[in-house]
């Protein structure tokens, strides 16, 4: 596991003639943000194919307004790195797409509008743990300068982040079967930990957290024998050395996606990822051009005007898919802290905070007791966003300003008389009744109708109960 990091240094007009017009104007101030998409290997993949290694979106940059008559300068950039975490091994060779997006902040109906300013792509070799690599890419008249690197997250080390290291427990050796971790000779290779519960007899793993099954076994923990001993899905050159997975029937069996679409299972059914030029539930709709308006949810369509040339939809934040048809459920990441309610408004996320919390993500805990005083020796108790006073004896109400009358609720039963007392209340019982609240009748024979005595006590022994 590790993180790919991208640092944007500048985005502005490239050298040479034909400087681009500024993307912002006095009438339409705007700001930039960037998106990076990473794919393993050196393949020339379609722009909308999944970002299998991961993707990231930057923060918004500062608002920029064009100065009339001035050439387009380097535009103000968002702060910070773009970070793309990867869970498995770093592949060493990768493809990237970096998109520069413009957010217009004019008086658009329904919030800001997005449009793609530039897209650059490339294929690179990169070892994890190495220094920052610098790059310059041009897209039309625009130029993007950036640096990138891949780094492993502890305890992973190595050029692919596949070796695990941990500090030595003793200076001299690492323990049975564990080698020193070059170049960190003061650390040892850490044991690989598979998915919890993975069968030690029928399962194995080569990456942390996985569980692959030996031939003849299946299930998430390789505890289910399969009916046939032949390996249906050998991984690698021979099933004997690498094991296999035996899949059961699934919604993608027989590939319901037409026109070269790829099928992926979802909790309820399946989903088709369609090649460019096709869309629909099963990629069955074809021959689409930008003139047909295939991009939903405000997606920007780029492509030829004839049916043979494919189109690409550039989706606004919050939407994805080859036709921007899928809403990204950004609330599923639970961005609102402290029990706040998440609202995905399409153009933005909003958090509705519980009382006592504030901030864009409800991250600030307000001091409920700040500036609140409880009278008559009461103490303020913070909790749940509403202050509460714990009042001294004899006082009540929200701020302990009311003198409490313990007899107001008529606590003495059977006509008993209530007297307020500094320690609470006292009941003077009417003849024939007894108990702290005069709740027990006294029988004529002297015994009282008390509850059944606990083990070891005699019934009718009143002083034991009072």
């Amino acid at each position: 596991a590790g993180v790919f990091e991208l640092q944007i240094h500048s985005f502005g007009p490239g050298p040479g003639p034909g400087a681009p017009r500024s993307p912002c104007s006095a009438r339409l101030p705007c700001r930039l943000f960037f998106r990076v998409c990473l794919k393993p290997g050196l393949s020339e993949e379609a722009a909308e194919s999944p970002c299998a290694l991961g993707a990231a979106l930057s923060a918004r940059g500062p608002v920029y307004t064009e100065q009339p008559g001035a050439p387009a300068p380097d535009l103000p950039l968002p702060d910070g790195l773009l970070q793309v975490p990867f869970r498995d091994a770093w592949p060493g060779t990768f493809s990237f797409i970096i998109e520069t997006w413009r957010e217009e902040l004019g008086d658009q109906i329904g919030g800001p509008a997005w449009s793609l300013l530039a897209r650059v792509a490339g294929r690179r070799r990169l070892a994890a743990g190495g220094p920052w690599a610098r790059d310059i890419q041009r897209a039309g008249a625009w130029e993007l300068r950036f640096s990138y690197r891949a780094r492993c997250e502890p305890p992973a080390v190595g050029t692919a982040c596949t070796r695990l290291c941990r500090p030595r427990s003793a200076p001299s050796r690492c323990g049975p079967g564990l080698r020193p971790c070059a170049p960190l000779e003061d650390e040892c290779e850490a044991p690989l930990v598979c998915r919890a519960g993975c069968s030690p007899e029928h399962g194995f793993c080569e990456q942390p957290g996985e569980c692959r099954c030996l031939e003849g076994w299946t299930g998430p923990l390789c505890t289910v024998p399969v009916s046939t001993s032949s390996c249906l899905s050998p991984r690698g050159p021979s099933s004997a050395t690498t094991g296999c997975l035996v899949p059961g029937p699934g919604p993608c069996d027989g590939n319901p996606c037409a026109n070269g679409g790829s099928c992926s299972e979802t909790p309820r059914s399946f989903e088709c990822t369609c090649p460019r030029g096709f869309y629909g539930l099963r990629c069955e709709v074809s021959g689409v051009t930008c003139a047909d308006g295939p991009c939903f949810n405000g997606g920007l369509c780029v492509g030829g005007a004839d049916p043979d040339s494919a189109y690409i939809c550039h989706c606004p934040p919050g939407f994805q898919g080859s036709n921007c048809e899928k809403r990204v459920d950004r609330c599923s990441l639970q961005p609102c802290r402290n029990g706040g309610l998440c609202l995905d408004l399409g153009h933005a996320l909003r958090c509705r905070c519980r009382a006592g919390f504030a901030g864009p993500r409800c991250e600030h805990d307000l001091d409920d007791c700040a500036g609140r005083a409880c009278a008559n020796g009461g103490t303020c108790v913070e909790g749940g966003g509403a202050h509460r006073c714990s009042c001294a004896l004899g006082f009540g109400g929200r701020d302990c300003r009311e003198r409490a009358d313990p007899c107001a609720a008529r606590p003495c039963a059977h006509g008993g008389r209530c007297y307020a007392h500094f320690s609470g209340l006292v009941c003077a019982c009417a003849p024939g009744y007894m108990g702290a609240r005069c709740e027990f009748p006294v029988h004529p024979d002297g015994a009282s109708a008390l509850p059944a005595a606990p083990p070891g006590l005699r019934p009718g022994d009143p002083q034991r109960y009072l």
Partner: nanobody, 127 residues
């Protein structure tokens, strides 16, 4: 410290048989994988066969399937490799390996699975 001691290697003609033994001293291995590995001169170490102690699983490299048999005598705390129909390409130093704490990390024919190893015994197949 567990010690694994291999024996039974030697010179044998092609088509012949040998039985290798691996005795585990000071420790009774009651669960986890034990395996046989080999390394021919100038080649990488490769997994030959593995058996799960306390279970019924046995695994073999494709190159030895049908010719080699792995087994274990629990009472003697000894692992065996019966090698039949030997070929010249079976010539190698054969190592016994044991995994003392059963866990799923790595395939049973991957040497990284094992934390204890013997010193090896040489098998030479030649006419």
């Amino acid at each position: 410290e567990v010690q694994l001691v291999e024996s039974g290697g030697g010179l044998v003609q092609p088509g012949g048989s040998l039985r290798l033994s691996c005795a585990a001293s000071t420790y009774t291995i009651s669960s986890g994988y034990m395996g046989w590995f080999r390394q021919a001169p100038g080649k990488e170490r490769e997994g030959v066969a593995a058996i799960y102690i306390g279970g019924s699983t046995t695994l073999y490299a494709d190159s030895v399937k049908g010719r080699f048999t792995i087994s274990r005598d629990n009472s003697k705390n000894t692992l065996y490799l019966q090698m039949n129909s030997l070929r010249a390409e079976d010539t190698a130093v054969y190592y016994c390996a044991a995994q003392l704490r059963p866990n799923a990390a790595y395939h049973p024919l991957d040497g990284r699975k094992y934390n204890y190893w013997g010193q090896g015994t040489l098998v030479t197949v030649s006419s």
